[in-house]
Amino acid sequence: QEDEDGDYEELVLALRSEEDGLAEAPEHGTTATFHRCAKDPWRLPGTYVVVLKEETHLSQSERTARRLQAQAARRGYLTKILHVFHGLLPGFLVKMSGDLLELALKLPHVDYIEEDSSVFAQSIPWNLERITPPRYRADEYQPPDGGSLVEVYLLDTSIQSDHREIEGRVMVTDFENVPEEDGTRFHRQASKCDSHGTHLAGVVSGRDAGVAKGASMRSLRVLNCQGKGTVSGTLIGLEFIRKSQLVQPVGPLVVLLPLAGGYSRVLNAACQRLARAGVVLVTAAGNFRDDACLYSPASAPEVITVGATNAQDQPVTLGTLGTNFGRCVDLFAPGEDIIGASSDCSTCFVSQSGTSQAAAHVAGIAAMMLSAEPELTLAELRQRLIHFSAKDVINEAWFPEDQRVLTPNLVAALPPSTHGAGWQLFCRTVWSAHSGPTRMATAVARCAPDEELLSCSSFSRSGKRRGERMEAQGGKLVCRAHNAFGGEGVYAIARCCLLPQANCSVHTAPPAEASMGTRVHCHQQGHVLTGCSSHWEVEDLGTHKPPVLRPRGQPNQCVGHREASIHASCCHAPGLECKVKEHGIPAPQEQVTVACEEGWTLTGCSALPGTSHVLGAYAVDNTCVVRSRDVSTTGSTSEGAVTAVAICCRSRHLAQASQELQ
């Protein structure tokens, strides 16, 4: 009854505001779009997030909401504005009939509308607890700095903040935005309501079983007693964090999102905004044994997305499902039988499994790294997490075949020392989404805002591709790969590096007339070659018999097929030096690799020649991998010959700066 009265009251106000002439003329031109969760059971029709254009002010948001209510009322529909967003994203949350969507999409300032959907805790079995004492010696792990300068926000269930493991470490905020529990006979048992959040708080900062024992935490309740929440509730939680950050700026902030729902444009956008405000977000990849790119916030590029492995460094199986995987995962971390605080009693411990637990590990590691180096940016932190991870220890056979190459084979680890990594040139590999199979399809891979794109390569499982090129987009270089006719699609692979004070440009040579192949070099003074790309318009690049190896004494040169245009990435940065390393195999082979030596970082990876039997090239950690078609399907031996070309760089400037600090 109260609810109905509330609706009526708002409706009257809405009508009055319409009469007061607050309505504006609708904008023409751009059409707002509607989005909803691809997973039907997770949809929450009747509640919608109306996202307004970026520059929209709060007053305009409120006016647009009132206008929607007024127009809906004229059509005989009741609506209720549940929340007006500002601080992170402009917009509002509205309860209304789906019949009004067409109307709402035509309102001024509207960018897009997303139907609300569910998000879920990512632990199993988070309410079937098995109480166990900590099964380790506590003095085996006592880090020098426990993350004491960092505040970790946890968006989860309610938590038992006075549990012995976490007492005094967790401040329970007054934020709560959760849906009603399902089922009429649901019995709210306090210890079960607190289970998931208490365990994760313990994994992050617990006295005895925590990763960052010195980190202080703040908890927001966005998941109910069944571990279920909503995208809208999570959005409002993220907005709460942003407002808290503005009101009382503290040291570095880490936000742990141990939850997942279907792909959500709005949730990813909110995460992007918060990340760009200097907040480190860490999330669970999801427990659906599926591509993490199909889930949010796991699919948000600005978020550090964590998959789960077990004590043997194998991907975690969870019942019939297991950890998510794919290019949207940044790294893996322990996520099976993780011991942490149990809400069953104030001294109890329990083991839980899932990508939530894995994400909590990484949030703890991040807190420790940020406590040691509070000025680290998100890009620097992500690169360090990748750099210090255990490499190539995961058995990739567990992943679907088409996801193996895309999934990072990295298990998070604490740096041997929290200081002293500053001299390193850090790079990571970023895969694009699949282009799709159409003739002109392209795929784009992008680096983070404060990373430099140092090289660009492409890969196609069918081998039908038209190479790749680096191009400017919005003032930043991106890596674009091109599909070919009859191809099943391509991936673009960007090599993204941290290179302070870098000035990079792309030099292009069009296809050569002569038969010797195309060449391009870095001709500007002080610029060094960091990567080579080639792109061709012809459908099938023929064999390239003449030698294509780089002439001696010309390290700053890219060479390629005469029918291809060649692109050289040339960079100037203090103390940057690079060298080209090649590994050619005369006999046909499905994979050719070349690695950079200790102290050097792989910045570029390409194949010679760029003929059609080469599937592509990509960097895996410090190794350049060139893949060719199955040798049994390849024709002549000469066509089978492939050379992997690595460009290895280091920065003397970073090394000197590091020595001066020590």
Partner: antibody, heavy 115, light 109 residues
Framework: QVQLVQSGAEVKKPGASVKVSCKAS????????ISWVRQAPGQGLEWMGW????????NYAQKVQGRVTMTTDTSTSTVYMELRSLRSDDTAVYYC????????WGQGTTVTVSS | QSALTQPASVSGSPGQSITISCTGT?????????VSWYQQHPGKPPKLMIY???NRPSGVSIRFSGSKSGNTASLTISGLQAEDEADYFC?????????FGGGTKLTVL
């Protein structure tokens, strides 16, 4: 500032009960429980148990289990410790302290059990 | 009988350093990071001096330090001062409760 203020001294006969109070202030109560510790004259410290301000859950030491009851009154931010069937060896100073970490202590309440 | 064993007394001259040991088992001191040390002057409540093995609360002099090896924790007081004369108690978590040491009387000569 963080403070725990306890009730005054008590003299009880053997077999009786005593109820000591401890009023907490200056911090977020739900972030810590309250421990009770006693100290017999000239002796060491003995942990008696713990109670949660958050949900009222308790954890009693085996030695006093069955004779002790700890309760909270969240409206007044007060914790109570009741000890029944008093014996002469229950004569001690009873302290409340913040949480399991016991980083802040009350001033103590002397309980004398004498016939 | 206290669960944790401490020497009944130790003494030292002003300016000297002393160490008080606290021995338990793998079920208490050895199994947890949560060893605390308390100072108690006569007629006063205990005061926390060290928590979680080696951390000092704000306001506690840097002359007080804690460490742990295996099942034994230690409190070291350097540059002894007259006001350090007091009883010192260690405590540790056990799986379900808390235990204290019997206490050590520190005399500053």
């Amino acid at each position: 500032q963080v403070q725990l203020v306890q009730s005054g001294a008590e003299v009880k006969k053997p077999g009786a009960s005593v109820k000591v109070s401890c009023k907490a202030s200056g911090y977020t109560l739900t972030s810590y429980g309250i421990s009770w510790v006693r100290q017999a004259p000239g002796q060491g410290l003995e942990w008696m148990g713990w109670i949660s301000f958050y949900n009222g859950n308790t954890n009693y030491a085996q030695k006093v289990q069955g004779r002790v009851t700890m309760t909270t009154d969240t409206s007044t931010s007060t914790v109570y410790m009741e000890l029944r069937s008093l014996r002469s060896d229950d004569t001690a100073v009873y302290y409340c302290a913040r949480g399991y970490g016991m980083d802040v202590w009350g001033q103590g309440t002397t309980v004398t059990v004498s016939s | 009988q206290s669960a944790l064993t401490q020497p009944a007394s130790v003494s030292g001259s002003p300016g000297q350093s002393i160490t008080i040991s606290c021995t338990g088992t793998s079920s208490d001191v050895g199994g947890y990071n949560s060893v605390s040390w308390y100072q108690q002057h006569p007629g006063k409540p205990p005061k926390l001096m060290i928590y979680e093995v080696s951390n000092r609360p704000s306001g506690v002099s840097i002359r007080f330090s804690g460490s742990k090896s295996g099942n034994t924790a230690s409190l070291t007081i350097s540059g002894l001062q007259a006001e350090d004369e007091a009883d010192y108690f260690c405590s540790s978590y056990t799986s379900t409760s808390m235990v204290f040491g019997g206490g050590t009387k520190l005399t500053v000569l």
